[in-house]
């Protein structure tokens, strides 16, 4: 069956994409140059292999944890795929532009790449509360508005409250999640008749989903302790992340099955407040002195997310018109706030302990840098959501929501699959 | 006994390159991160660049961005500094200093706890 | 964040008591360091993380302070402490060090 995306989408997206790709490859040409340092090459591999990781989570784990979906899961993979492609070039000349360009190049290292790929995760996280809903040129949009968003956020951040690598980039759990429900509150909410069974999950999709969910898992430690800058504080960051998401997997399924009449485990739950645990330490993992801390941390995450799962879908449906196995988004939120109030808890027990009276000078700056990340994740999050309304990117149909025919090439198919 | 010993230093003409290498010895060395700092005759110390510990990350002060590259071979405990286009105000000792990370109560605090002896670089014509 | 290192120099008797203070641009939260530095020589660490005591530096010598506030002091000041000391913040790069307090023999 052929693409049912209307005649001028045709036209539009390809020259949108290849033009922007041929910009993107202009601006390389011109403003960057490889490291060219010699260096010990046991080192470059080891780097390279935390680039690799999140290389992993970004396209095996989020591209599948989103691809739940009876209708839409080819899309939600591929699109995932093509975001992060497009993310990851626009992100290394961002960060590169916003922090080397007055040396006149831009200097591409691995480190580069790892700091881009972990901003192209920002739209990978944010993009699960409207895929389905909008085709690739809108998706284009995003890409680059929430890649800048995000770059210019860290920049701001690190400028005024003069936070880390570290710091600025862990913001990324609220600043995504809030982006993606500003967005979706945006676009078309209600689905016509008759097209409800598209967002529902079926089984084979929903096994892939939880295979995106095993990556995301398995390399969650990665990702938390990727910028930290000194040995000591990357295995603290691991071992935390560790044992946290270790425990939230038992809460989920546990606390799945006893939120449920029938003890059963719902698998939309599962997928996501398995990694509960590694969003809530993620801004004070490589802090939190003994594991037994992690753990709790890693139990509380579960049970916020499980009581999420059941409870926000209902008016996250309503009010945003996210469906109910997008969870991601509002999950995020909470998390990612929680993990942010953990931080500010060690931050006072740190001045507390070092017996000064700064405490409501620290909290007070931590709460604007959180507060700033909010700001700017609704006001470009509600910005792009304009964007995307605009009629020149051929928004699918509502009737179409949820519906890989309309995006992809089915031979074998004559309705439906 | 943690030691740095510089090198490289020496009198170069405005517009041309140099190299300097800092050998450690006596502890670990790759499980530091390590930076270059320098001190102008008669005036303060100035901070240049640092090399995270496994080389993933080097970050310049403005002052000698694109044009000094830092890097470091941990098989052979060494660390570097190419400076390029070397101009009359880069004329220092350049020091390289060993960054030691310590908790503190909850925080991680950041020192320079060794030093090398230093190395004179004159840039004139 | 710029650091900014009050008086630039003193002149002290061996005995008394040297107050140093040091003012960051941002908030550095605990992330200050104070150096020694002698003519001809590397700087040596004296405090890290605004007040604790590098190992082998006699306990004449305190740090205290937080967020943008730092004080270094010598509560005796002895023959051998006479030399230019340095704040430098280590909370974010650009690692920046204060402009330096000369420490003189009155």
């Known amino acids: 069956m052929s693409s049912k995306y209307p005649r001028s989408v045709r036209r539009c997206l390809p020259l949108w994409a290849l033009t922007l790709e041929a910009a993107l490859i202009l601006l390389f040409y011109f403003f960057t140059h490889y490291d060219a340092s010699l260096e010990d090459q046991k080192g470059l591999v080891a780097s390279y292999q935390v680039g690799q990781d999140l290389t992993v989570m970004a396209a095996i784990g989020l591209g599948f944890l989103t691809s739940s979906f009876r209708r839409h899961s080819w899309s939600s993979v591929a699109f995932n795929l093509f975001m992060l492609a497009l993310g990851v070039q626009w992100a290394i000349l961002l960060d590169g532009f916003l922090s080397q360009f007055p040396s006149g190049k831009v200097v591409i290292t691995l480190f580069s790449i790892r700091l881009a790929t972990m901003s192209a995760l920002s739209v990978l996280i944010s993009v699960d509360a409207v895929l389905g809903k909008v085709n690739l040129a809108q998706l284009v949009v995003m890409v680059l508005v929430e890649v800048t968003a995000l770059g210019n956020l860290r920049m701001v951040i690190s400028n005024i409250f003069n936070t880390d690598y570290h710091m600025n980039m862990m913001h990324i759990y609220v600043f995504a999640a809030y982006f993606g429900l500003s967005v979706a509150w945006c676009l078309p909410k209600p689905l016509p008749e008759g097209t409800e069974d598209k967002d529902q999950t079926a089984t084979i999709p929903s096994l892939s989903a939880m295979l995106g969910a095993l990556f995301l898992w398995m390399f969650w430690p990665s990702f938390n302790s990727a910028l930290l800058r000194s040995p000591i504080e990357r295995k603290n960051a691991v071992f935390n992340t560790y044992y946290a998401v270790a425990v939230s997997v038992v809460t989920a399924i546990s606390g799945s099955s006893l939120a449920h009449p029938q003890g059963k485990i719902s698998k939309t739950y599962v997928h996501s407040a398995v990694l509960a645990g590694g969003v809530a330490v993620g801004t004070s993992c490589h802090l939190i002195p003994s594991p037994w801390l992690a753990m709790v941390l890693g139990l509380v995450a579960g049970l916020i997310s499980v009581g999420g799962a059941k409870y926000l879908p209902g008016c996250c449906n309503r009010v945003l018109g996210i469906p109910h196995s997008s969870i991601m988004g509002y999950n995020f939120s909470l998390l990612g706030l929680l993990g942010e109030i953990i931080y500010i808890v060690l931050l006072v027990l740190d001045t507390v302990g070092a017996g000064n009276g700064m405490i409501g000078f620290q909290v007070l700056l931590s709460i604007g840098e959180l507060s700033l990340a909010i700001v700017i994740a609704l006001m470009s999050g509600l910005l792009t959501g304009l964007l995307l309304n605009l009629k020149i990117w051929k928004a699918p149909h509502e009737a179409k929501y949820f519906d890989d025919q309309v995006f992809w090439k089915f031979p074998h198919l004559a309705v439906g699959f | 006994e943690v030691q740095l010993l510089e090198s490289g230093g020496g009198v170069v003409q405005p517009g041309r390159s140099l190299r300097l290498s800092c050998a450690a010895s006596?502890?670990?060395?790759?499980?530091?991160?390590m930076h270059w700092v320098r001190q102008a005759p008669g005036k303060g110390l100035e901070w240049v660049a640092v090399?995270?510990?496994?080389?993933?990350?080097?970050e310049y002060a403005d002052s000698v961005k694109g044009r000094f590259t830092i890097s470091r071979d941990n098989s052979k405990n060494t660390l570097y500094l190419q400076m390029n286009s070397l101009r009359a105000e880069d004329t220092a000792v350049y020091y390289c200093?060993?960054?030691?990370?310590?908790?503190?109560?909850?925080?991680?605090?950041?020192?320079?706890?060794?030093w090398g002896q230093g190395t004179l670089v004159t840039v004139s014509s | 964040a710029e650091l900014t290192q009050s008086p630039s120099s003193l002149s002290a008797s061996v005995g008394d008591r040297v107050t140093i203070t040091c003012r960051a641009s941002q908030n550095i939260r605990r992330s200050l360091n104070w150096y020694q530095q002698k003519p001809g020589k590397a700087p040596k660490l004296l405090i890290y993380?605004?007040?604790s005591l590098q190992s082998g530096v006699p306990s004449r010598f305190s740090g205290s302070g937080s967020g943008t506030d730092f004080t270094l002091t010598i509560s005796s000041l002895q023959p051998e402490d006479f030399a230019t000391y340095y704040c430098?913040?280590?909370?974010?790069?650009?690692?920046?060090f204060g402009q330096g307090t000369k420490v003189e023999i009155k």
């Open positions: 200093a060993r960054e030691e990370v310590v908790r503190g109560v909850i925080l991680w605090s950041r020192k320079f706890d060794y």
């Open positions: 430098q913040q280590s909370s974010n790069t650009p690692w920046t």
């Open positions: 993380a605004a007040s």
């Open positions: 006596g502890f670990t060395f790759s499980t530091y991160g």
């Open positions: 090399i995270w510990f496994d080389g993933s990350n080097k």
